[in-house]
């Protein structure tokens, strides 16, 4: 008996004392466990275990299936085993034919046998195939052949377990390996759309994809800082060995305001985890926001091109859109086009063209769109810059010089003198008064300042200028003096 | 060649002590159960006592006549076996045989010439 | 102790002669049996091992049956060579005690 300190529990001792014994078939197996404390025996091969609370284990007429580890334990939970094989000429393996093997480990073929005196115990291919060139086992007769390091490669590898028994090789029923691929890259995922914009009591539903070698990827829907478990529905596909998709939907059957918030697909293996979001927006109506890409206060010279453009978001969908001028909508020389192609896009561009600007062009520009639930508006303020032209230059009965001119900006209107027929003049002349005519009118359009000048000042042949000009450019009109004695004979306006 | 050779028997008074060798060869003496067997002269054999493998945690057993009085020990580096026996008394007189277990079963498949041992005054 | 009792203890035969020999236990040792065959002067010989099994190299005139406590050693044809004293052993419980012997004798 082994050693122990007097008082100190010890194993059962078993009868017959070996470690391994081998019974013919048919025979009688016979184990005594000897111990004051004796509580069982139990039996196990492959997945089945069998109890015995006698002190003697008789199986009368051993079978192949006898065949297995025998154990003995008393009341201290100390044990001692036996493994029994039951020799039988007919049945060499005991096969549990299920085999998985995890890529990069070790897996167990499970063939043990009844008879561990017979050589040659080893992994054969099926059909007389070879093996895999790499492919390593360890032969064990009580446990099976363990397969070192499965690849990826053996995946549905046909197997025999085989020994040589009385100079004959003897082959297992066969065994198809499965192997399940390691995670060597954390899951793919992806969403259907990366943001929502619904209304109240619409459905909302959102479809993760997850991507893994295998099945056995763990995926599920989060709500952002919530715990709330969410109800989604699952497919899934094998693409070929080791190409494994799941699709995840998460439904909201009628959404309101308070599921806004950021939802997550998160998924993860051994090697790591992966997630994508998406943004859910929920209004309890549907909004249009306009954004105007210029000033809404637009200046531009005659004859030149400008372009009103905005931006919009509208959701729903937009669904009229026009421009006006002066209660007119343009049919032509506009475009609407969404912002994106993508397909939760809500934004939109609407540009008016409008080419070679007359001064009589200028005016309120009104942008106008509407969907199912609102309309929304904006306005452009267009004023056309125009050079000064002088509508009337006349001598008035009172003597007075007088200068009328239109143009936008506000005309100035600046007098000088030039005596003789220089027409380069450069004394100015202080004007009597000046007057806006139109300060009152539209507000956009021409602006018309009137500008006099006393002509009795003037004591010399010479030429008068009336120049009015603005930001644009500059016009002049002249009036020539000719004295006769005391008396002005002539006073000729040109221009 | 697969054997076992004894030694270590001869002359002992009663009381006294002797301690007998087997020396094996041939085969992995590590992994086997030993016994020692012994027989008195004219008479039928009788079973001394076993030690296990390492596999049987070196487990030693022996028959009532000798227990207490004879060890069994081992040194499987030297692939050797031993029987060291105390007190010795005449009716250990006896050729003693040292045998080798099978893997799989209790018998003796292997068995040495034997090395006499009297015990005498 | 288990005790093993063998009959005959010695019994005449002549060449060619049918032999058999038993081996009673005292409590069931199953099959957990074994014959020896021992001349004067050598170490025993192993016959049979597991109440039936016949070692490797034994002639297959030699062969042996029973279960439990009943035990047969049987010599089909006895040849010269045969003439010696038999042995059986119980190697259930230990201590692993040996039968008395039978010695077999020329006629």
């Known amino acids: 008996q082994p050693s122990v300190s007097p008082g100190e529990p010890s194993p059962p001792s078993i009868h017959p004392a070996k470690s391994e014994l081998i019974v013919r078939v048919g025979n009688e197996i016979r184990l005594l466990c000897i111990d004051p404390g004796f509580v069982k025996w139990t039996f196990e091969i492959l997945d089945e275990t069998n109890e015995n609370k006698q002190n003697e284990w008789i199986t009368e007429k051993a079978e192949a299936t006898n065949t297995g580890k025998y154990t003995c334990t008393n009341k201290h939970g100390l044990s001692s085993s036996i493994y029994v094989f039951v020799r039988d000429p007919a049945k060499l393996f005991l096969v549990d034919r299920s085999l998985y093997g995890k890529e990069d480990n070790d897996t167990l073929v499970r063939c043990p046998l009844t008879d561990p005196e017979v050589t040659s115990y080893s992994l054969k291919g099926c059909q007389g195939k070879p093996l895999p060139k790499d492919l390593r086992f360890v032969p064990d007769p009580k446990a099976g052949i363990t397969i070192k390091s499965v690849k990826r490669a053996y995946h549905r590898l046909c197997l025999h377990c085989s020994a040589d028994q009385e100079g004959k090789s003897v082959l297992s029923d066969k065994f198809i390996l499965k192997v399940r691929p390691a995670f060597k890259a954390v899951p793919v995922v992806s969403v259907s759309k990366a943001s929502y914009l619904l209304r109240e009591g619409e459905e909302f539903t959102v479809t993760c994809t997850i991507k893994d070698v295998s099945s056995s990827v763990y995926s599920t829907w989060k709500r952002e800082n919530s715990q709330t478990k969410l109800q989604e529905k699952y497919n899934s596909w094998h693409h070929g060995d080791f190409n494994y998709e799941r699709q995840a939907t998460l439904t909201i059957s009628s959404a309101r305001v308070n599921d806004s918030g950021v939802f997550m697909c998160y998924a993860n293996n051994t090697f790591g985890s992966a997630n994508v979001t998406t943004t859910l927006e929920v209004v309890d109506k549907g909004f249009i926001n306009i954004f105007p890409m210029i000033n809404t206060t637009v200046f531009v010279n005659d004859g030149e091109n400008v372009d009103l453009i905005v931006e919009y978001e509208a959701f729903p969908k937009p669904e009229h859109q026009q421009w006006i001028y002066m209660n007119r909508t343009f049919t032509d020389k506009w475009e609407d086009y969404p912002k994106s192609e993508n397909e939760s896009n809500i934004r939109y561009v609407s540009e008016l063209h409008l080419t070679r600007l007359k001064g009589t062009e200028g005016g309120t520009y009104t942008f106008l769109v509407s969907n199912s639930d609102v309309n929304a508006s904006i306005a452009f303020n267009v004023y056309v810059n125009t050079k000064p032209e002088i509508l009337t230059y006349d001598r008035l009965v009172n003597g007075m010089l007088q200068c009328v001119a239109a143009g936008f900006p506000e005309p100035t209107i600046d007098w000088y003198f030039c005596p003789g027929t220089e027409q380069r003049c450069s004394a100015s002349v202080l004007p009597v008064d000046v007057q806006t005519l139109n300060a009152s009118g539209p507000p956009f359009g021409k602006l018309v300042v009137q500008s006099s000048i006393d002509s009795s000042a003037f004591k010399h042949n010479g030429t008068v200028e009336c120049k009015a000009y603005n930001d644009v450019g500059k016009t002049s009109a002249y009036f020539n003096f000719a004295f006769k004695g005391n008396n002005k004979e002539q006073i000729h306006p040109h221009t | 060649e697969v054997q076992l050779v004894e030694s270590g028997g001869g002359l002992v008074q009663p009381g006294g002590s002797l301690r007998l060798s087997c020396a094996a060869s041939g085969f992995t003496f590590s992994d086997a159960d030993m016994d020692w067997v012994r027989q008195a002269p004219g008479k039928g054999l009788e079973w001394v006592g076993r030690t296990r493998n390492k596999a049987g945690s070196y487990t030693t057993e022996y028959a009532a006549s000798v227990k207490g009085r004879f060890t069994i020990s081992r040194d499987d580096s030297k692939n050797s076996l031993y029987l060291q026996m105390n007190s010795l008394k005449t009716e250990d007189t006896a050729v003693y045989y040292c045998a080798r277990e099978p893997k799989y079963w209790i018998d003796f498949d292997l068995w040495g010439r034997g090395t006499l041992v009297t015990v005498s005054s | 102790d288990i005790q093993m009792t063998q009959s005959p203890s010695s019994l005449s035969a002549s060449v060619g002669d049918r032999v058999t020999i038993t081996c009673r236990a005292s409590q069931s040792i199953s099959s957990y049996l074994n014959w020896y065959q021992q001349k004067p002067g050598k170490a025993p010989k192993l016959l049979i091992y597991?109440?039936?099994s016949l070692q490797s190299g034994v002639p297959s005139r030699f062969s042996g049956s029973g279960s439990g406590t009943d035990f047969t050693l049987t010599i089909s044809s006895l040849q010269p060579e045969d003439f010696a004293t038999y042995y059986c052993q119980q190697s259930y419980i230990a201590p692993y005690t040996f039968g008395g012997g039978t010695k077999v004798e020329i006629k």
């Open positions: 597991a109440a039936s």
